[in-house]
């Protein structure tokens, strides 16, 4: 878990224990098993704007 | 350039342990993970475990819980591996490897292998 | 945990012709992000392993293009189109999909 009173990831990063720093989502396609690629999987979709009001 | 160097040739008893060491030069140790494999003469390749040096977090092949300990020493950049209760079975080449965590893959980078004989 | 299935030996290859080492995972090795995560390594006699191909058919850099590899999720190939004699040793393939890190046997390539 993150530490607590350290700034939250970044959109398109997650937190890693491991390496104690949040770390590029992008890095999952590397090794796809590494402790925060669960929580890139986890992230909801970057929000996208309605067509209609 | 990324080197790994491991220690020299151990001979050692049955039931005694032993702890080999990889110094990491060329990168930022921290950053990558080290990952310890285990070759028997003419033999394949039998992932150990692997550390986080970083934060020394590890993750075993349930195989070698209780058999190897690995530790990192970030102020030295060197990754050990102690084995324990020592066997003939034990007797191998080890190897460490430098295996990356990020989208730029980079390939992995290998020790030249500590040859650990157990014998009486 | 991913076992990794080679034959110990690949068909004696003459210099100059081509030769294919395959290898089989008990699970798929592609992922739902599309790479399959398949390596190959050669260890030349006397040395370390080194990486040859990565996720399934990316050369690894220094290595000639005289190698390159395919296959589905399970069932894989790696192919030398010209055998040079520094080509000689064991072919490893390996996975990267998740932990237990596992390798296949081994395939030593001979020549004729």
């Known amino acids: 878990e993150q530490a607590p009173g350290t700034a939250p990831c970044s959109r398109g990063s997650s937190w890693s224990a491991d390496l104690d720093k949040c770390m590029d989502c992008a890095s999952c396609r590397a090794r796809p098993h590494s402790d925060f690629c669960l929580g890139c999987a986890a992230a909801p979709p970057a929000p996208f704007r309605l067509l209609w009001p | 350039q990324v080197q790994l160097q491991q220690s020299g040739p151990e001979l050692v008893k049955p039931g005694a342990s032993v702890k080999m060491s990889c110094k990491a030069s060329?990168?930022?140790?921290?950053?990558?993970?080290i990952a310890w494999v285990k070759q028997r003469t003419g033999q394949g390749l039998e992932w150990i475990g692997e550390?986080?040096?970083?934060?020394?977090?590890?993750y075993y092949s349930e195989k070698f819980r209780g058999k190897a300990t690995l530790t990192a020493d970030k102020s030295s950049n060197t990754a050990y591996m102690q084995l324990s209760s020592l066997t003939s079975v034990d007797s191998a080449v080890y190897f460490c490897?430098?295996?990356?965590?990020?989208?730029?893959?980079?390939?992995?980078?290998w020790g030249q292998g500590t040859t650990l004989t157990v014998s009486s | 945990d991913i076992v990794m299935t080679q034959a110990a030996f690949s068909n004696p290859v003459t210099l100059g012709t081509s030769a294919s080492i395959s290898c089989r995972s008990s699970?798929?090795?592609?992922?739902?992000?599309?790479?399959?995560?398949l390596y190959w390594y050669l260890q030349k006699p006397g040395q370390s392993p080194q990486l040859l191909i990565y996720?399934?058919?990316n050369l690894a850099s220094g290595v000639p293009d005289r190698f390159s590899s395919s296959g589905s999720g399970t069932d894989f190939t790696l192919r030398i189109s010209r055998v040079e004699a520094e080509d000689v040793g064991v072919y490893y393939c390996?996975?990267?999909?998740?932990?237990?890190?596992?390798f296949g046997g081994g395939t030593k390539l001979e020549l004729k």
């Open positions: 490897a430098r295996r990356t965590i990020y989208y730029d893959y980079d390939g992995d980078y």
């Open positions: 060329g990168y930022t140790f921290t950053d990558f993970i």
């Open positions: 550390i986080y040096p970083g934060t020394g977090r590890t």
């Open positions: 699970k798929s090795l592609l992922h739902s992000n599309g790479i399959t995560y």
């Open positions: 996720q399934m058919s």
């Open positions: 390996a996975h990267n999909l998740e932990l237990p890190w596992t």
